[in-house]
Amino acid sequence: MAVTACQGLGFVVSLIGIAGIIAATCMDQWSTQDLYNNPVTAVFNYQGLWRSCVRESSGFTECRGYFTLLGLPAMLQAVRALMIVGIVLGAIGLLVSIFALKCIRIGSMEDSAKANMTLTSGIMFIVSGLCAIAGVSVFANMLVTNFWMSTANMYTGMGGMVQTVQTRYTFGAALFVGWVAGGLTLIGGVMMCIACRGLAPEETNYKAVSYHASGHSVAYKPGGFKASTGFGSNTKNKKIYDGGARTEDEVQSYPSKHDYV
């Protein structure tokens, strides 16, 4: 039951996380114009990965996609790539995890297959979350660098064709959404990996009853290892009985024909 709950919760947490990563990627508020010490108050600018928006003092807002002819910084392209990779990996992870859910029966899929799929989706969620966190962090670093560069250039650039950055930008809402969403996806992935351990078939060790035979003294000891008499070939305590592959949820305490020799 605990395995099913962990897997289900991991799936839900990852689903929320990936929805957040998609939302953050589409949002326009990755950076917002810093209003402190800014003489320009008639227009307020906020920017996303794909377009820039300006809110006029009249209340009218206009957005435009970035003009590709001017070229975009390599860092921005890298952030876009990281977010898209995160979304794609997350989406594939969600698809895989749906089929891996213990509560869903698809044909005669064995627990070992479900365990492998759970692990795969968990790893995908972890990588997806890391991509989102990395993308948002790279963008945040770019804003911090730009902020201090803008502050240094605030009263320079007069005369000649000098290009200075005058407007300073601070963290927008999308950055926080991205960080939280990436974290949730990461946590969900870890939960799926933990659930995988419980789903994986384990070798069950049975406690056996001690038994005295008429011939050589042979007994089964707990752990399923044959106690060697010194005459047999099993001198290295090799496991001579492999318990049936059963999941944690299916282990039964009833005596079976293998419990007694």
């Epitope: 008639a42 820039s52 300006v54 009249s58 009218f60 970035y66 950055v165």
Partner: nanobody, 118 residues
Amino acid sequence: EVQLVESGGGLVQPGGSLRLSCAASGQFFSLNYLAWYRQAPGSQRELIALVSSGGSTQYGDSVKGRFTISRDNAKNTVYLQMASLKPEDTAVYYCNLHTYDFLGRDYWGQGTQVTISS
């Protein structure tokens, strides 16, 4: 390459009028504002007036009611109509184009001298 060319500066008597113009050429992001700044000797740069691509305007406290900014989007030109000029309006007037592409860009003109003296 974006270029800003100012014109219209000169010597005017106190109380007189002057019209500055600034033409922007080249390719630039459509979300922007065109502004006029001035810098008197020994002083910091001061925002006089700006007009955004959407038509919003803003004026500095020292010129409110005396100066009027306008823009011709077809010609990518900004005009600053200055009236009731005072000796303290003497400065070098700079045209500024700020584009709102990724993290913003600023372009500056060479500046035009405006002198108010009798």
